[in-house]
Amino acid sequence: IWELKKDVYVVELDWYPDAPGEMVVLTCDTPEEDGITWTLDQSSEVLGSGKTLTIQVKEFGDAGQYTCHKGGEVLSHSLLLLHKKEDGIWSTDILKDQKEPKNKTFLRCEAKNYSGRFTCWWLTTISTDLTFSVKSSRGSSDPQGVTCGAATLSAERVRGDNKEYEYSVECQEDSACPAAEESLPIEVMVDAVHKLKYENYTSSFFIRDIIKPDPPKNLQLKPLKNSRQVEVSWEYPDTWSTPHSYFSLTFCVQVQGKSKREKKDRVFTDKTSATVICRKNASISVRAQDRYYSSSWSEWASVPCS
Amino acid sequence: RNLPVATPDPGMFPCLHHSQNLLRAVSNMLQKARQTLEFYPCTSEEIDHEDITKDKTSTVEACLPLELTKNESCLNSRETSFITNGSCLASRKTSFMMALCLSSIYEDLKMYQVEFKTMNAKLLMDPKRQIFLDQNMLAVIDELMQALNFNSETVPQKSSLEEPDFYKTKIKLCILLHAFRIRAVTIDRVMSYLNAS
């Protein structure tokens, strides 16, 4: 058993049918010595008397808020949560496996630049009685500071019969140098509590590996005289690290017909312009990627050919 | 990714082309190592990230772009120098700060070159003959060092009398390649910045 926060405790259980569970001793936080009784949650049934209460915690019916009283007055509370270990592996019931970029990916994180700011998000089908708390650091043995805000519900979508809820959090490394070469990964830890179930999820990454630039901005077309060709031009996104000559991007320009089946013409360039043939009803899209370290491509910025 | 490769303009900063080749070569070598050594811990998540140049060179700090000198987090405890304008020790007079940056890059290359050559000698003794260093990568390191045109003492190749542990050598190869790729990215950024200056 360990303390998650004041008066909230997590009991770790080897979870299998007929498991013996864990013996837990609760102590009433009071100078009083006698006339103390214990109850669980809203029930008025007295579970025991005395300054300490010994219980055998086996399943969720044994978890909850234990309260010690004296003469109708509440003295203190202890909330017991359960953390299930199933065949040597901690349970992952609360969050959905996003399966991207690989199986067992519960937390996904992205950064728009090298400033040390990043966003993480996760998915759940649970709508109520759910709380999250997020901590982060650079490295784990001698951790350096990363400050995270509160997790917020950022999106809701319907998937088949189920509603899916997306939560996200923004974090900022306390002292980040955009040019630094990372040798210790960022660690992100999310505590999730649903009713009386506790779970924790972690992710470990280098900022360089989670970079996803914003799409190029000010995408414009300039027709070339006496030609079907157009000059496409764009600019670096505002959120990208500066100076751009040091943090350079490379670009992919795509001409896509109205039908998804039509052949796509693609050109790669390090410049912020390109000459392409603009077909009728086609659209031109441009996306960006770090020129020197192949992390994710940005989303596409698009303009119609007409 | 397979991108069309642009050939540099003749007047281009001489080292940019070499540094781009270096990054391409080390990335290819790392990819090959990850595929060949699939049963070894060779991915970024599995290896320890060690920097053999730590406390010996200060490339990141010495080559910091002027715009980042206002960022206190970039100003380490070490004495930091900042690159200004100049070329790859070409015809124009190179500033002192610039020389510090480029000599730091040269020292990095020299250290990695020695490590890779020592390692290759060990890998050639492996009866499994599973993996060797790409000669192209070693050649590209050499070309960039020549373009940087610094004269420094030759570091003797380390020779080891004990029987090599091939498992450990292959894991060390992965660690070195990961670290060298990160340094090659920094070198490329620096060269690109200098080219634009």
């Epitope: 080897d14 979870w15 299998y16 049918p17 498991a19 399943e59 065949d87 592996i89 690989k102 | 049963f39």
Partner: antibody, heavy 115, light 112 residues
Framework: QVQLVQSGGGVVQPGRSLRLSCAAS????????MHWVRQAPGKGLEWVAF????????YYADSVKGRFTISRDNSKNTLYLQMKSLRAEDTAVYYC????????WGQGTMVTVSS | SYVLTQPPSVSGTPGQRVTISCSGG????????VKWYQQLPGTAPKLLIY???QRPSGVPDRFSGSKSGTSASLAITGVQAEDEADYYC????????????FGTGTKVTVLG
Amino acid sequence: QVQLVQSGGGVVQPGRSLRLSCAASGFTFSSYGMHWVRQAPGKGLEWVAFIRYDGSNKYYADSVKGRFTISRDNSKNTLYLQMKSLRAEDTAVYYCKTHGSHDNWGQGTMVTVSS
Amino acid sequence: SYVLTQPPSVSGTPGQRVTISCSGGRSNIGSNKVKWYQQLPGTAPKLLIYGNDQRPSGVPDRFSGSKSGTSASLAITGVQAEDEADYYCQSYDRGTHPALLFGTGTKVTVLG
């Protein structure tokens, strides 16, 4: 004590369907994940499928994906395996099993796919 | 499609020490716990070892398990006639959990 009693096995022609059941008692069935494991005659153990305690997630071996469906009825304390488009290579003893460091197995039920 | 490899058979005379190996990889045994099962003819498998080296109550102490790196092993110290059975190791793969990965199985024969 924990008990898993299986039923539903038998002889079936290729291409036909069969549903296996596993009735649980002696524990809070709705709190635990469950597996199906099979063993072809004279062969080793092969995992078939898994279902979460609340039925929210299901996982299948590639060899049965799209043909077999694992399900549970927590009000009846019963686990099911619906098998469709059966093939000769599905001939095996099928076991249900609890998920956990200490596990309990059903007695097994024989499924023979033969024309 | 078995990822955990066991020797097909091992044998020993009563009282001898018999060991069965189970070889896997970094993503399965290297990252997860190992179990061992005993299966007597015509019966369901019976758990012998869980958590690499833990014995459930009721399992004789002549059975012991261990794990090192990407391999695990089961030892029967002082093998007895009633130990003649098939033995299977089981683990998970970190990418496909909760799918069970079983070993190829080992037939233990007690001679004499």
